[in-house]
């Protein structure tokens, strides 16, 4: 029961996490204009992985996609790639984990197969979560670097005519969504891996044996099986002392040539 609960909870947590990763990837507010020490402006700028937006004080917003692919910064391309890999792995993991759920019965799927599938999906969720966290962290690092670079530029070139002052950008909502979602996917993956251990069946290689009190007459059986184990027939056809033990199949006695004497 605990295994089913752990697996189910892991699935739900991962599902929420992957939905969050998708949401974060699609969101426009990865970086937002830093309004601290900024001139009073009627417009507000923010950017996502796919497009840039400008919002007017009235609320009207205009966005434009990054149409060029080659002209984009390598870091942005890397973040895009990490997020997409995270989504793809997460989606495959979800698909695998649906069939792995203990509460869902599909044909005559054995527990060992479900355990393997649970472990596979768990690993996929962990990698997916790590990809999302890495992608968001790379972008955040890029923002921090640019923030301090533009801050430094504010004090350069004061003697000259042109002051190369740049707008500073800070963390957008998408970064926090991405971090939380990546963490949830990671936790869900760990839970799936824990559930896998409970699903894996114990190896049992023994037959059920019923014991009968042995009588005074001791029977010798040609080509008999060792009653204590479920392995290996007596290929050399040696007579084995049965000791009164019979497997369920051997309860019925078979006639021998001595019975007709």
């Amino acid at each position: 029961m605990a295994v089913t609960a752990c697996q189910g909870l892991g699935f739900v947590v991962s599902l929420i996490g992957i939905a969050g990763i998708i949401a974060a990837t699609c969101m426009d507010q990865w970086s937002t204009q830093d309004l601290y020490n900024n001139p009073v402006t009627a417009v507000f700028n923010y950017q996502g992985l796919w497009r840039s937006c400008v919002r007017e004080s009235s609320g009207f917003t205009e966005c434009r996609g990054y149409f060029t692919l080659l002209g984009l910064p390598a870091m942005l391309q890397a973040v895009r790639a990490l997020m997409i890999v995270g989504i793809v792995l997460g989606a495959i993991g979800l698909l695998v984990s649906i069939f792995a759920l203990k509460c869902i019965r599909i044909g005559s799927m054995e527990d060992s197969a479900k355990a393997n599938m649970t472990l596979t999906s768990g690993i996929m969720f962990i990698v997916s979560g790590l990809c999302a966290i890495a992608g968001v962290s790379v972008f955040a690092n890029m923002l921090v670097t640019n923030f301090w670079m533009s801050t430094a530029n504010m004090y350069t070139g004061m003697g000259g005519m042109v002051q190369t002052v740049q707008t500073r950008y800070t963390f957008g909502a998408a970064l926090f969504v991405g971090w939380v979602a990546g963490g949830l996917t990671l936790i869900g993956g760990v839970m799936m891996c824990i559930a896998c251990r409970g699903l894996a069946p114990e190896e049992t290689n023994y037959k059920a044996v019923s014991y009968h009190a042995s009588g005074h007459s001791v029977a010798y059986k040609p080509g008999g099986f060792k009653a204590s184990t479920g392995f290996g027939s007596n290929t050399k056809n040696k007579k084995i002392y049965d000791g009164g033990a019979r497997t369920e199949d051997e309860v019925q006695s078979y006639p021998s040539k001595h019975d007709y004497v």
């Epitope: 204009q33 840039s52 400008v54 009207f60 205009e62 434009r64 990054y66 060029t68 190369t164 707008t167």
Partner: nanobody
Framework: QVQLVESGGGLVQTGGSLRLSCAAS????????MGWFRQAPGKGLEWVAG????????DYADSVKGRFTIARDNAKNTVYLQMNSLKPEDAAIYYC????????????????WGQGTQVTVSS
């Protein structure tokens, strides 16, 4: 890389009007936010106005609000600055600038610049 060429500058009387044009060489003109800056003799670069990709959002400096109008024609790859009720303090070299992602008042955000056109206002 987009190349910008300004035109329309000249000498005008106080209270008069001028229309500045900025033609872009790049066919991807519509993917740039455009801005106008000016530099008066012995002064720093001052932002005048800006316009988004399709012209949906326009922003103006307080000193020119109500007198200047920015517009763009993406079919002609051109941005315009209509200047009315000109004052002597409007005399400067006017620069056209382009940037791909943000409508800001800071010169450092603009990647591409024109060579400028002189506007003189006589009293």
């Amino acid at each position: 890389q987009v190349q910008l060429v300004e035109s329309g500058g000249g000498l005008v009387q106080t209270g008069g009007s001028l229309r500045l044009s900025c033609a872009a060489s790049d066919s991807t003109f519509s993917s740039y936010i455009m801005g106008w800056f000016r530099q008066a003799p012995g002064k720093g670069l001052e932002w005048v106005a800006g316009i988004t990709w399709s012209g949906g959002i326009k922003d103006y400096a307080d000193s020119v609000k109500g007198r200047f109008t920015i517009a763009r024609d993406n079919a002609k790859n051109t941005v315009y600055l209509q200047m009315n009720s000109l004052k002597p303090e409007d005399a400067a070299i006017y620069y056209c600038a382009a940037n791909a992602i943000q409508l800001t008042r800071r010169s450092g955000d603009y990647a591409y610049w024109g060579q400028g056109t002189q506007v003189t206002v006589s009293s």
